[in-house]
């Protein structure tokens, strides 16, 4: 048997081209110079290499760059990026948004993989904060990206970046995340007029405190029930029947359909039945007339 480690005569690759697709895996390993591969990475994507052949090429790059690939190579990885492990990616130092975009493009249409999550993490940490351009890029590829971050990570998002956020980007955010994002959104949109402000702030309201909801109720915003149902329960409870009526406007009728669900259910339990009756919706479960309501939390605070 011929020892298959040395490149056969006449097979040494002079450039990365189509002729390589019919090289055996061991021939690719023996005949393709890793430095040549690194400088011509952009050509790899145009050549229909098999999955196995791509592994050989990756192995050559790994041997050439044991400490991690330089950005000049990373930017042109193309489909070879799909072969990288999170451990590989942790060795990288990606600073260019163009590089990030190029790699996200490769994974487009698929769910966020561990590789992509690691890449984004490395990129954002390298930048120090989640700036507007980065957020624009990430939410364009992954609408749920923002909601995948921890509240701690979200705290590094500058208010200016909030302009890039679309309502669908917040669909999977939980209250803890909205608690962090809401004050940033409020700051970002503070110079807008009433109706425009409400359109922009609406998807962040799951993090709004009671006083902001009270203020909104004075502005004829006509909040829809879907938004109301996402509000923090502790923020809704102190609202009066009149305030909720103003906040919802014509949508107030929707309370009946939601009376068994939070936060409506809990809010009803805190209202006087007399006040609820004024809505004419047949909401039941309020405090009967003649009962005295003691706010124990207030009493504790005073003592």
């Amino acid at each position: 048997e011929v020892e298959k480690t040395a490149c056969p005569s006449g097979k040494k690759a002079r450039e990365i081209d189509e002729s390589l697709i019919f090289y055996k895996k061991w021939e690719l390993e023996a005949c393709v110079d890793a430095a040549l591969l690194a400088t011509q990475m952009d050509r790899v994507n145009a050549i229909p290499f098999t999955y196995e052949q791509l592994d050989v090429l990756k192995h050559k790059l790994d041997e050439l760059y044991p400490q991690g690939y330089p950005e000049s190579v990373i930017q042109h990885l193309g489909y070879l990026f799909l072969k990288m492990s999170p451990e590989d990616i942790r060795k990288w130092n990606v600073t260019s948004l163009e590089t990030l975009k190029a790699l996200l493009e490769v994974n487009k249409g698929h769910e966020m993989s561990p590789q992509v999550a690691t890449l984004i993490d490395r990129f954002v940490k390298g930048r120090g904060q989640l700036d507007k351009d980065t957020l624009d890029t990430l939410t364009a590829f992954y609408p749920g990206y923002l909601c995948s971050l921890s509240p701690e990570e979200l705290s590094s998002v500058p208010p200016s970046s909030i302009w890039a956020v679309r309502p669908q980007d917040l669909d999977t955010c939980d209250p803890r995340q909205l608690d962090v994002l809401y004050p940033k959104a409020r700051l970002a949109f503070q110079n807008m007029n009433g109706s425009e402000y409400f359109v922009k702030i609406q998807s962040f309201l799951g993090g709004a405190p009671t006083e902001d909801l009270k203020a909104l109720s004075q502005q004829n915003v006509s909040m829809d029930l879907a938004t109301f149902m996402k509000l923090r329960t502790d923020a809704v409870l102190p609202l009066t029947v009149a305030e909720v009526q103003k906040l919802l406007g014509p949508h107030v009728e929707g309370l009946k359909a939601e009376e068994r669900h939070r936060p409506v259910r809990d809010w009803i339990l805190r209202q006087r039945q007399d006040d609820l009756d004024t809505l004419g919706l047949g909401l039941q479960g309020g405090i009967p007339n003649g009962y005295l309501v003691l706010d124990l939390s207030m009493q504790e605070a005073l003592s």
């Epitope: 019919f22 055996k24 895996k25 061991w26 196995e52 592994d55």
Partner: antibody, heavy 122, light 110 residues
Framework: QSQLVESGGGRVQPGGSLRLSCAVS????????MGWVRQAPGKGLEYIGY???????YYASWAKGRFTISKDNSKNTVYLQMNSLRAEDTATYFC????????????????WGQGTQVTVSS | ALQMTQSPSSLSARVGDRVTIKCQAS??????LAWYQQKPGKPPKFLIY???DLASGVPSRFSGSGSGRDFTLTISSLQPEDFATYYC????????????FGTGTKVTVL
């Protein structure tokens, strides 16, 4: 003289798991690819997958997810982990070496082990 | 997905006959093809690689030809020990394929 000996076969219930081993001698796993092939009674050869010298694994489309190939170079042993076994997985399981010292499956399988029988039934 | 089709599935022949077995790939695989011989109760035996190169110790009556999609295994003069099942195998792409082996051709005594 290169030798391959499979072990770990036997009877297993549907839904169960089994790990087959292939002990090799006469060559190094860091220089050769190793594959697994099975053959149901009276049927043809069916490729399961292989592991290259550098540890990258490749599988038949039907085997992905249920079957896992691994190796321990220091123990000169290759493994086939089989999960969620079904009656149709009943077969003789062969391990085989890549014939080429290039370390990938480039030329074919040679030599082969004698095989180990796996029966899946309740 | 890359598939291998072998024909015929079985054939009967006499000692001394010339036997030809065909293997077709669903796409071009260059010369990345191997042939095996298998007898009942035994593991396969490696016969040919690179479509036409004889493996070590294989008698010269066995030969292989073809490139691209169509391949042939020929036994020039069938011997008693050649009655067996023959399989082709593509080694061009071994990832995520249904099977790298052909369906097999059983050669029996006429």
């Amino acid at each position: 003289q290169s030798q391959l000996v499979e072990s770990g076969g036997g009877r297993v219930q549907p839904g169960g798991s089994l790990r087959l081993s292939c002990a090799v001698s006469g060559f190094s796993l860091s220089s050769y690819a190793m594959g697994w092939v099975r053959q149901a009674p009276g049927k043809g050869l069916e490729y399961i997958g292989y592991i290259s010298k550098i540890g990258t694994t490749y599988y038949a489309s039907w085997a992905k997810g249920r079957f896992t190939i691994s190796k321990d170079n220091s123990k000169n042993t290759v493994y086939l982990q089989m999960n969620s076994l079904r009656a149709e997985d009943t077969a003789t399981y062969f391990c085989a070496r890549g014939s080429s010292s290039g370390g990938y499956l480039d030329d074919g399988f040679d030599p082969w082990g004698q095989g180990t029988q796996v029966t899946v039934s309740s | 997905a890359l598939q291998m089709t072998q024909s015929p599935s079985s054939l009967s022949a006499r000692v001394g006959d010339r036997v030809t077995i065909k293997c077709q790939a669903s796409q071009s695989i260059s010369n990345y093809l191997a042939w095996y011989q298998q007898k009942p109760g035994k593991p396969p035996k490696f016969l040919i690689y690179d479509a036409s190169d004889l493996a070590s110790g294989v008698p010269s009556r066995f030969s292989g030809s073809g490139s691209g999609r169509d391949f042939t295994l020929t036994i020039s003069s069938l011997q008693p020990e050649d009655f067996a099942t023959y399989y082709c195998q593509q080694v061009y792409d071994s990832n995520n394929v249904e099977n790298v082996f052909g369906t097999g051709t059983k050669v029996t005594v006429l």
